[in-house]
């Protein structure tokens, strides 16, 4: 079949990084600059993807891959491709439309990204708070508090915390 | 909130250089990941898009307009100007300067209300 | 340049309606495709961004599909503040090029 298709149509001949080109005589021509086919048989080479402003070259344009973009320092990639760069926050903040804000008492977030979750409750697994959440750090939960030996306290568990996706205001 | 305001003459003749002030708040041009753009748009057609410029003073330009486009940036002053040499009667448009989408690129999320130039002898 | 182009240019349309208005690239432009609505006299103002990000304070009418060549506008239940012109803009690669619009028109 392959045979038979580049017999019939030259333009199959003309592999990933070239062009069929009809201006001149369907010979294979190289992709211009910033330009780039990725697979053979193409009529035209699609336009490289450029990475500028908030976005840097990850990977750069050849004749046969586009290029690939992520985010300058202090943005991450959000979206397919990463189609969008989200600035980064402090662990122990969220991102909200006015910028990085601290969690609210009884939740956290360990990365420089995403939304600050409520700490676990230890009590829902009839267990006891060993450590104590900060914005940065969820709980420790320890033994129930039926295991600990006579006398021994444990620290108390924490407020029922917010709803998750609930930015401070 | 963010808001912008051309500013500029509403008529100039051909081969003039017209000069158009983009005067904003609400944001610093001087903040990683701003930038702002010029769109125009002739009476009764699509938009078209002119230059940018990003807070770390990156331009880029319309191919086809290139040699004719300068685009500046005050930061203290709130302010990007644009200027465009040799105007012809085809360059008759509303010129919008617009705020990019914080984090995407050519993204215009926040317009002006636009400026009325019209090239007639 | 990537070329877009929009269909139908325009198109009338009753309030309550569902209306599509499509939007195709001259190449693959991932999901680097934004959508504005324009009145006359009016700027732009954008609504669906990354081919299907609502825009903050657009209604929920609104939404956007699509990635590669074929994007698509559905306004799920065309209201009386809907009637304008929309246009599809890539933001792929350097110059942003927007479709030559679609006039939504009272039937």
């Known amino acids: 079949f392959e045979r038979t298709r580049s017999l019939q149509d030259p333009c199959s001949n003309c592999p990933a990084g070239t062009f069929c080109d009809n201006n001149r005589n369907q010979i294979c021509s190289p992709c211009p600059p910033n330009s780039f086919s990725s697979a053979g048989g193409q009529r035209t080479c699609d336009i490289c993807r450029q990475c500028k402003g908030v976005f840097r070259t990850r990977k750069e344009c050849s004749s046969t891959s586009n290029a690939e973009c992520d985010c300058t320092p202090g943005f991450h990639c959000l979206g397919a491709g990463c189609s969008m760069c989200e600035q980064d926050c402090k662990q122990g903040q969220e991102l909200t439309k006015k910028g990085c804000k601290d969690c609210c008492f009884g939740t956290f977030n360990d990365q420089k990204r995403g939304i600050c979750r409520p700490w676990t409750n230890c009590s829902l697994d009839g267990k006891s708070v060993l450590v104590n959440g900060t914005k940065e750090r969820d709980v420790v939960c320890g033994p129930s508090p039926a295991d600990l030996s006579p006398g021994a306290s444990s620290v108390t568990p924490p407020a029922p915390a917010r709803e998750p996706g609930h930015s401070p205001q | 909130q963010i808001t912008l305001k051309e500013s500029g003459p509403t008529l100039v003749k051909p081969t003039q250089t017209l000069t158009l002030s983009c005067t904003f708040s609400?944001?610093?041009?001087?903040?990683?990941?701003?930038?702002v753009g010029w769109i125009r748009q002739p009476p009764g057609k699509a938009l078209e898009w002119l230059a940018l410029?990003?807070?770390?003073?990156?331009?880029y330009f319309s191919p086809s307009l290139k040699s004719r486009l300068t685009i500046t940036k005050d930061t203290s002053k709130n302010q990007v100007v644009l200027t465009l040499t040799n105007m012809d009667p085809v360059d008759t448009a509303t010129y919008y300067c617009?705020?990019?989408?914080?984090?995407?690129?050519?993204?215009?999320?926040?317009w002006g209300q636009g400026t009325m130039v019209t090239v007639s002898s | 340049d990537i070329q877009m182009t929009q269909s139908p240019s325009s198109l009338s349309a009753s309030v309550g309606d569902r209306v599509t208005i499509t939007c195709r690239a001259s190449?693959?432009?991932?999901?680097?495709l934004n959508w504005y609505q324009q009145k006359p006299g009016k700027a732009p103002k954008l609504l669906i961004y990354?081919?299907?990000s609502l825009q903050s304070g657009v209604p929920s009418r609104f939404s956007g599909s699509g990635s590669g060549t074929d994007f698509t506008l559905t306004i799920s239940s065309l209201q009386p503040e809907d009637f304008a012109t929309y246009y599809c803009?890539?933001?792929?690669?350097?110059?942003?090029?927007f479709g030559q619009g679609t006039k939504v028109e009272i039937k």
């Open positions: 617009a705020h990019t989408l914080w984090g995407s690129d050519d993204v215009f999320d926040v």
């Open positions: 803009q890539q933001s792929y690669s350097t110059p942003p090029t």
């Open positions: 609400g944001f610093s041009l001087s903040t990683s990941g701003m930038s």
């Open positions: 410029i990003y807070w770390n003073d990156d331009k």
């Open positions: 990354a081919a299907s």
């Open positions: 190449q693959s432009i991932s999901s680097y």
